[in-house]
């Protein structure tokens, strides 16, 4: 392992849809992938009128944009459907919404997922 | 192991549409990237866009604002793409590859697009 | 973003060393180290041999190594051997934020 990096070797896993695609509902997602590439965490959400709909988490491949990030953040200006991938284990189980806004200050929402 | 399976070849009159399909397995469909890239007879390749899997987020490359749609059907591991307003200079062979990397290719599509 | 630029074609005789560059932009092959190495044989799908300027991909030889200084990306294959002769691609990262582009492509021939 690199100094300073953290290393993904398993990811909270959520399936909202799970029974239509015969998974598990939730649990603990062990990552796989090549030795020498990087593995990350990811969580997809919706916002139905405010009220956050958790779609799916899990494991990611290689990925640059989700490089050294600890923490995961969607930073697309209003996504259909909220992607955020982070590194490090289970650091997808929280994850928050900082748009990057061209003229304005980046506001906050902090999403903290309830447990299904 | 990896494989991304890809729909048959394709004869289209210009101006008809296309839909091509990339079936993966081996692998969690939903934990990467699907690139499409296009190879024109005797030409270099040509990226066209990507759809990240899991959001169905996509980005596509300028030339093909307007004319291109990818999407995917998480519950079939498949990828699409499907390019409209088809002219001759869109005849080659498609493929998809796998994540950022491109780690893992389709075998391509032959779409020739001719009157 | 537009594409990177390759020599057409570069040869060289079996055992021989030869390198491959692919020049860019200090926005795009200069600030990260996200380029890529295809090789292309005839008839066939392209194939990743180096990823992120210097990673030999899983399974490739040893004999392929990549590097870069400033703008420009290089594909070193060593003791060329007569399977090598193939087109050769450099390209970049896409997905999320970052747009796919690739270079014109070299075809390498081996003597």
């Known amino acids: 392992a690199i100094l300073g990096r953290s290393e993904t070797q398993e990811c909270l896993f959520f399936n909202a849809n799970w029974e239509k695609d015969r998974t598990n509902q939730t649990g603990v997602e062990p990552c796989y992938g090549d030795k020498d590439k990087r593995r990350h965490c990811f969580a997809t959400w919706k916002n139905i009128s405010g009220s956050i709909e958790i779609v799916k988490q899990g494991c990611w491949l290689d990925d640059i944009n989700c490089y050294d990030r600890t923490d995961c953040v969607e930073k697309k200006d209003s996504p259909e459907v909220y992607f955020c991938c982070c590194e490090g284990n289970m650091c997808n189980e929280k994850f928050s919404y900082f748009p990057e806004m061209e003229v304005t200050q980046p506001t906050s929402n902090p999403v903290t997922p309830k447990p299904p | 192991q990896v494989q991304l399976v890809q729909s048959g070849a394709e004869v289209k009159k210009p101006g008809a549409s296309v839909k091509v399909s990339c079936k993966a397995s081996?692998?969690?469909?939903?934990?990467?990237?699907i690139n499409w890239v296009r190879q024109a007879p005797g030409q270099g390749l040509e990226w066209m866009g990507t759809?990240?899997?899991?959001?169905?987020?996509?980005s596509y490359a300028q030339k093909f604002q307007g004319r291109v749609t990818m999407t995917r059907d998480e519950s079939i591991s498949t990828a699409y793409m499907e390019l409209s307003r088809l002219r001759s200079d869109d005849t080659a062979v498609y493929y998809c590859?796998?994540?950022?990397?491109?780690?893992?290719w389709g075998q391509g599509t032959l779409v020739t697009v001719s009157s | 973003q537009s594409a990177l630029t390759q020599p057409a074609s570069v040869s060289g005789s079996p055992g021989q060393s030869i390198t491959i560059s692919c020049t860019g932009t200090?926005?795009?092959?200069?600030?990260?180290?996200?380029v890529n190495w295809y090789q292309q044989h005839p008839g066939k799908a392209p194939k990743l041999m180096i990823y992120?300027?210097?990673k030999r991909e899983s399974g490739v030889s040893n004999r392929f190594s990549g590097s870069k200084s400033g703008n420009t990306a290089s594909l070193t294959i060593s003791g060329l051997q007569a399977e090598d002769e193939a087109d050769y691609y450099c390209g970049t990262f896409a997905g999320g934020k970052y747009y796919g582009v690739f270079g014109g492509g070299t075809k390498l021939t081996v003597l």
């Open positions: 992120g300027v210097s």
């Open positions: 081996g692998y969690t469909f939903t934990s990467s990237y």
């Open positions: 200090s926005s795009d092959v200069g600030s990260y180290n996200y």
């Open positions: 590859a796998r994540g950022g990397w491109f780690d893992y």
């Open positions: 759809i990240n899997a899991v959001s169905g987020s996509t």
